[in-house]
Interface confidence: low
């Protein structure tokens, strides 16, 4: 025996209370497929949500977010607060990116600047809170000997040229090693200061501009979750 409800098209429901007559969906409800015994309540786009597509008898309403917010989740189930470029959303709201990180969008988290030296390149344009650094040619490419417009040098004995080159390479290597050593030393000191704060008594703590900026920026502790500061759910 065929189920009489299977004849009910989308936009109607099979009304058991009226001998399984196909009744139109009541206001604010819909059925997107035929043969349904009830209509679903339309989604209400309220508050920070805004109606992108009105509910019809056969399809649900679709929401998006009011200006200053953006959609998150399947079908825009949440509206999350926009931040400015150079900021990220934390549990305490929008916070500036920490030094060394940037965000060029109104959403998402601050990402570290590109480390040009890893690719053997140098920093051409410094990074900001809103923009990544721009890497340029490697330091070797920028050395005077690499310039394509230098006038031809007077001829010398081959041995002399080799000495100069060796000296130049040795100096460059020493400089690079010194830089790497200083960076490592700084990192180790920073780690020791964090791990053993009692070793570094108050006199070491100078309230520089950078230290003050640290409080206002969004450096996230391991236990602090991303987002969650400005999310609104329907």
């Amino acid at each position: 025996l065929q189920d009489p409800c299977s004849n009910c098209p989308a936009g109607t429901f099979c009304d058991n209370n009226r001998n399984q007559i196909c009744s139109p969906c009541p206001p604010n409800s819909f059925s997107s497929a035929g043969g349904q015994r009830t209509c679903d309540i339309c989604r209400q786009c309220k508050g920070v949500f805004r109606t992108r597509k009105e509910c019809s008898s056969t399809s649900n309403a679709e929401c998006d977010c009011t200006p200053g917010f953006h959609c998150l989740g399947a079908g825009c189930s949440m509206c999350e607060q926009d931040c400015k470029q150079g900021q990220e959303l934390t549990k305490k709201g929008c916070k500036d990116c920490c030094f060394g990180t940037f965000n060029d969008q109104k959403r998402g988290i601050c990402r570290p600047w590109t480390n040009c030296s890893l690719d053997g390149k140098s920093v051409l344009v410094n990074g900001t809170k809103e923009r990544d650094v721009v890497c340029g040619p490697s330091p070797a490419d920028l050395s005077p000997g690499a310039s394509s417009v230098t006038p031809p040098a007077p001829a010398r004995e081959p041995g002399h040229s080799l000495q100069v080159l060796t000296l130049f390479l040795a100096l460059t290597s020493a400089l690079l090693l010194a830089l790497i050593f200083i960076t490592l030393l700084f990192s180790v000191l920073k780690w020791i200061r964090k791990k053993f704060p009692h070793i570094f008594k108050q006199p070491f703590k100078k309230t520089t501009g950078a230290a003050q900026e640290e409080d206002a920026c969004s450096c996230r502790c391991p236990q602090e979750e991303e987002g969650g500061g400005g999310g609104y759910e329907l």
Partner: antibody, heavy 123, light 107 residues
């Protein structure tokens, strides 16, 4: 914070009608469905129906459709349920509840509850 | 209407034990299920929605699971404040329907 205030108790004569109130505060009253739920002593919960205050659109459980009438007064942010011709079977605690603010369709879970009004039908 | 059958109707357990309450729907409700906790003389409180998502402020010892027509609520390491009644509710379709409730008592 979201609050739904209901009177503690109502005594009603059999056959006379009773109108229960639920005063909402702490949110935009017109933006959330208000539900009514019945609980008889020592028993489970029964959904009576709900109303969307913005346009007074209602859904009812067929079991209560003929005797329960849901209305709202937007000016006072109050929802009402009128129960006509009550019998001893209607002696119960009646809760008003508000749908939550989670993502759709979890929006349709009852996140906020009033304290409930205990209705006693007795002559 | 979708009928919700909850079991057991009552349950005795001791502090520290783990208990599981089940709820069966008469049709597929596709995870549109909520669990509520109710203490004696108080209003119910939302515990779990979407079958497995904990409501805000609910301790992690509570967990919801299931799909289709079979769902369950598990409480690990029972605490004194967990005793009371538990109700499941489907919001797949109107009329919204509740299970008969499970009374969890101290042993």
């Amino acid at each position: 914070q979201v609050q739904l205030q209901q009177p503690g108790a109502e005594l009603v004569r059999p056959g006379a009608s009773v109108k229960l109130s639920c005063k909402a505060s702490g949110y935009t009253f017109t933006s959330y469905w208000i539900n009514w739920v019945k609980q008889r002593p020592g028993q489970g919960l029964e959904w009576i129906g709900n109303i969307f205050p913005s346009d007074s659109y209602t859904n009812y459980n067929q079991k209560f459709k003929d005797r329960a009438k849901l209305t709202v007064d937007k000016s006072s942010s109050t929802a009402y349920m009128q129960l006509s011709s009550p019998t001893s079977e209607d002696s119960a605690v009646y809760y008003c509840t508000r749908f939550g603010s989670s993502g759709y369709p979890d929006y349709y879970t009852m996140e906020y509850w009033g304290q409930g009004t205990s209705v006693t039908v007795s002559s | 209407d979708i009928q919700m059958t909850q079991s057991p109707a009552s349950l005795s357990a001791s502090v520290g034990e783990t208990v599981t309450i089940t709820c069966r729907a008469s049709g597929n409700i596709d995870n549109y299920l909520a669990w509520y906790q109710q203490k004696q003389g108080k209003s119910p409180q939302l515990l779990v929605y979407n079958a497995k998502t904990l409501a805000e402020g609910v301790p992690s010892r509570f967990s919801g699971s299931g799909s289709g027509t079979e769902y369950s609520l598990k409480i690990n390491s029972l605490q004194p404040e967990d005793f009371g009644s538990y109700h499941c509710q489907q919001y797949w379709t109107i009329p919204y329907t509740f299970g008969g409730g499970t009374k969890l008592e101290i042993k």
